[in-house]
């Protein structure tokens, strides 16, 4: 069965210092899937951030960078210049 596992449950981030979120795929080969990233904020709203290749939700393109690492079979989301408004729970998902 396919499983996407976050590398860390909690990621401490400093304002303005680039941060990287990683999501490891188990049971399947990540290159055969489209990876999506979402953010859930306090109001329980799930907001779309990124989908391969190079599709970003409104307002996310300038400060977020999504990619996959074929060698390590994981998905990567970089927050280039984190600010307080980037707080929340981040989710990775996949589809074909």
């Amino acid at each position: 069965a396919i499983e996407l596992v976050p590398e860390h449950q909690t990621v401490p981030v400093s304002i303005g210092v680039p941060a990287t979120l990683r999501c490891s795929m188990k049971g399947e080969a990540i290159g055969n899937y489209y990876i999506n990233w979402y953010r859930k904020t306090q109001g329980n709203t799930m907001t779309f951030i990124y989908r391969e290749k190079d599709i970003y939700g409104p307002g996310f393109k300038d400060n977020f960078q999504g990619d996959i690492d074929i060698a390590k079979n994981l998905a990567v989301l970089k927050i280039l210049a984190p600010s307080e408004r980037d707080e929340g729970s981040y989710y990775c998902a996949c589809d074909t």
Epitope: M25, K26, G27, A29, I30, G31, N32, A71, N73, T96
Partner: antibody
């Protein structure tokens, strides 16, 4: 037992397009990456490129301008086209499955663990 | 895409151990722990012997072992047998857009 069966002509004229197809039987096509590799007579192996089941591709930079790969998961087939061939493209062409799974579900790319039988392609007029 | 460097030939007597080296660069062997090794008998397709640097696929004898140090990977065949006589190729993942092979090493059992 997974097998890869190659098909396509063994003789191609210079400047024309080489076309080969690889059919996957006995296993899933969706859980691995699919590659083409060639070997000129008496020489070493050269990676041509890979295709993912969603259709994305990676090509050897030295061949990129001439290579096109495609995949049809419903037919369990993937294909190679190499355009503008010359004598230097004469070789045995192999299709190969890439990737190795361990018991915990970890996937390791970069390992070609199942190969087709090879097709000798000669470029000559 | 430049080849990985392997010795053209290596020989040994039955029962001996031999080692084949495979030298790359920091862009391939040195950057990824994704070196694989293949055995090829004349007229046959290559066969995977080692993946991810040192892991053996099921069904491969434990006489075959792989290792890596820096930009150089190695394949060791211990207890050399007549059926080990073949060509051996190393291969390294070199980023999403490339895979590089070595030039091949002919192993002769004396």
């Amino acid at each position: 037992q997974v097998q890869l069966q190659q098909s396509g002509p063994g003789l191609v004229k210079p400047s024309e397009t080489l076309s080969l197809t690889c059919t996957v039987s006995g296993g899933s096509i969706t859980s691995y990456y699919w590659n083409w590799i060639r070997q000129p007579a008496g020489k070493g192996l050269e990676w041509i490129g890979r295709i993912y089941t969603i259709g994305n591709t990676n090509y050897n930079p030295s061949l990129k301008s001439r290579v096109t790969m495609s995949i049809d998961t419903s037919k369990h087939q993937f294909s190679l086209k190499l355009s503008s061939v010359t004598g230097a493209d004469t070789a045995v062409y192999y299709c190969a499955r890439e990737g190795y799974y361990e018991s915990d579900g970890s996937f390791f790319p970069g390992a070609f663990n199942i190969w087709g039988q090879g097709t000798m392609v000669t470029v000559s007029s | 895409s430049s080849e990985l460097t392997q010795p053209a030939s290596v020989s040994g007597s039955p029962g001996q151990s031999i080692t084949i080296s495979c030298t790359g660069t920091s862009n391939d062997v040195g950057s990824y722990n994704l070196v694989s090794w293949y055995q090829q008998h004349p007229g046959k397709a290559p066969k995977l012997m080692i993946y991810a640097g040192s892991k053996r696929p099921s069904g491969i004898s434990n006489r075959f072992s792989g290792s890596k140090s820096g930009n150089t990977a190695s394949l060791t065949i211990s207890g050399l047998q007549a059926e080990d006589e073949a060509d051996y190729y190393c291969c390294s993942y070199a980023g999403t857009t490339n895979v590089v092979f070595g030039g091949g090493t002919k192993v002769t059992v004396l």
